[in-house]
């Protein structure tokens, strides 16, 4: 932190020492408490980190995340015949990403225009709620997917309606849980006018009363309950999965599955290392430093970590790719600008010419393919 006359910089949810209690007018009406922004805070709010770096990253996330997750959701809902538990979890993962990413144009505009929020209090709260909601939804659905992948290897039994219903029930429970845990983000006033900068910030400036105690406790609880515990479950599932795959007999098909499983594990590990661990760790450290020392020395790291956490919306499609045969086909053909139907017809035509007596493994009238679970 840059040395200043007033030591009240509070970081993102930056700032916010309220020097004294809220004022009470003669009519007994409490005037809205105002928030501390000092020289350091003002530098951050006008600096290149928030006005250049963040919008660049968010633009990349939006450009990559919106079409890839949009296509994934479409594939899982309309192009996958059997709704396996994995499909259900991935569909929810894609939906969570979409619900977060659709607001990014507002977020990008906000940062480009010097952290000036012009879209109203309600939209700011929605943006912040969805921002954190997406991160915690992603962690939980990724955990479900990881445990389910392990379960499939342990119990390679056929798809049952009961398993799909359980997956739907778990998914609904996750959405409800995330809605409940993000309520504080919707309730708290997130927009604050900063006169010196002539800007209205969204989430970047919050009152100290909220910050010091409540914010630390809030994010610590989330880090333990919605990050550490699911992370432990995910890690356990993959460790056990690797053990199982190592000990199993290897034919050509099993080798393919093993390689895909390893790629999936590496992708999820990358997501934890890039997106979830730094953001959750720094959320706790950042608010702990504010609580204990009155200022955060890790503010820049914290901003970068929170920004990188949004990259999960770009990494999730790789998970779909390694898990879903359907998504793989659609992704490959989307990149090659071909329709799946055309490819299927070509494959059918080739197959019928080569093996006229053998039945084709694909149906030309259907775009559905057998998914490997």
């Amino acid at each position: 932190t840059i040395q200043g006359t007033n030591r009240s910089s509070k970081g993102r949810s930056l700032i916010g020492k309220v020097d004294g209690t809220s004022h009470v007018t003669g009519k007994g009406v409490t005037v809205e408490t105002v928030f501390s922004v000092d020289e350091f805070s003002a530098s951050v709010l006008t600096g290149k980190l928030t006005t250049v770096f963040l919008p660049i990253v968010y633009t990349i996330v939006f450009v990559v995340g919106l079409p890839s997750n949009g296509m994934a959701l479409w594939v899982f809902l309309f192009r996958t015949k059997k709704k396996h538990p994995a499909v259900i979890y991935m569909a929810n993962l894609a939906l969570a990403d979409l619900l977060s990413v659709i607001w990014f144009p507002l977020k990008i505009a906000y940062h480009i225009h010097g952290n000036n929020w012009i879209y109203g209090e309600a939209l700011c709260n929605v943006l912040i709620g969805f921002f954190y909601g997406n991160m915690y939804c992603s962690i939980l659905f990724m955990t479900c997917l990881s445990v389910q992948r392990y379960w499939v290897i342990v119990n390679p039994m056929g798809h049952s309606r009961k398993k799909a219903n359980i997956a739907i029930g778990i998914s609904l429970a996750i959405w409800l849980l995330i809605l409940l845990v993000t309520i504080p983000l919707y309730v708290v006033k997130q927009t604050i006018f900063i006169p010196a900068l002539n800007i209205t910030t969204c989430h970047d400036v919050l009152p100290e009363q909220l910050l010091v105690g409540d914010m630390f406790n809030y994010f610590l609880s989330l880090a333990i309950g919605v990050f550490l515990f699911p992370a432990f479950l995910t890690a356990s599932a993959y460790v056990l999965m690797i053990r199982m795959l190592r000990s199993s007999a290897m034919d050509e098909n099993s080798e393919k599955k093993r390689k895909r499983a390893i790629k999936l594990i590496v992708t999820v590990l990358a997501m934890y290392l890039i997106c979830f661990t730094p953001s959750n760790l720094l959320l706790v450290v950042h608010y702990f430093l504010i609580k204990s020392q009155g200022q955060s020395h890790v503010y820049a790291l914290y901003i970068v970590a929170l920004c990188l956490s949004t990259l999960n919306s770009c990494i999730d499609p790789f998970v779909y790719y390694f898990v879903s045969h359907d998504f793989r086909d659609h992704a490959k053909n989307a990149l090659l600008c071909r329709s799946v139907r055309t490819v299927k017809q070509m494959q059918v035509s080739l197959t019928s010419k080569k093996h006229s007596r053998k039945s084709s493994s694909y149906s030309s009238s259907s775009t559905t393919v057998k998914t490997s679970y």
Epitope: G4, T5, E32, V37, E39, T46, I192, P195, A196
Partner: antibody, heavy 121, light 107 residues
């Protein structure tokens, strides 16, 4: 001890230009916003221009916008005010201030002794 | 622009007396108000910021209050060194504006 010393004032004809300087000492210059405030003879105070500690953002009232330019050289701990197209109503003592940003606003905490600018033909 | 109107234009006070200067903003300024003192032939100095916060080194006999559009500066136990012109300033909306000033003299 915080010190701000303005210079560059004097008599100038209308339409001409003048550049004021403010050399500071006693504090880390690049940590603070700086402002120019003027006071016409026997009159009240008028805010002229403000600049952020990095120099990246500047703020002006409509009365001087497009004519005056505030800038800073953090290496030299010096604040500048370039005044172009001067008018008789710009006649005033120009003060350089070191600001405090508290609760998101600018408060003029330390003032220089001022430099007199007289615009007259 | 936000207009700042100070009253009275001038006043005299005896030693030890308590005096009050008012400042009215043309619109609500959410407590973003400062008070400055300018002694004859000197530069102004900050007394109070954010309506009621005392600047470092300023005697505690100076106090500020108010909210919305109405603010006041109170000087209890008037001293000879308190003579001068007092200005209010709003830091809520650009352009920053000042009141016309209140001249305080010792009786």
């Amino acid at each position: 001890e915080v010190q701000l010393v303005e210079s560059g004032g004097g008599l100038v004809q209308p339409g001409r230009s003048l550049k004021l300087s403010c050399v500071v000492s006693g504090f880390t210059f690049n940590n603070y916003w700086m402002t120019w405030i003027r006071q016409a003879p026997g009159k009240g105070l008028e805010w002229v221009a403000s600049i952020t500690n990095s120099g990246g953002n500047t703020y002006y009232p409509d009365s001087v916008k497009g004519r005056f330019t505030i800038s800073r050289d953090n290496a030299k701990s010096t604040l500048y005010l370039q005044m172009n197209s001067l008018r008789s109503e710009d006649t005033a003592t120009y003060y350089c201030t070191r600001d405090r940003i508290i609760r998101g606003s600018t408060w003029f905490a330390y003032w220089g002794q001022g430099t007199l600018v007289t615009v007259s033909s | 622009d936000i207009q700042m109107t100070q009253s009275p234009h001038s006043l005299s006070a005896s030693l030890g007396e308590t005096v009050s200067i008012e400042c009215l903003a043309s619109e609500g300024i959410s407590n973003y108000l400062a008070w400055y003192q300018q002694k004859p032939g000197k530069s102004p100095q900050l007394l109070i910021y954010y309506a009621s916060s005392l600047q470092d080194g300023v005697p505690s006999r100076f106090s500020g209050s108010g909210s919305g559009t109405q603010y006041s500066l109170k000087i209890s136990n008037m001293q000879p060194e308190d003579e001068g012109v007092y200005y209010c300033h709003q830091g809520y909306k650009y352009p920053w504006t000042f009141g016309g000033g209140t001249k305080l003299e010792l009786k």
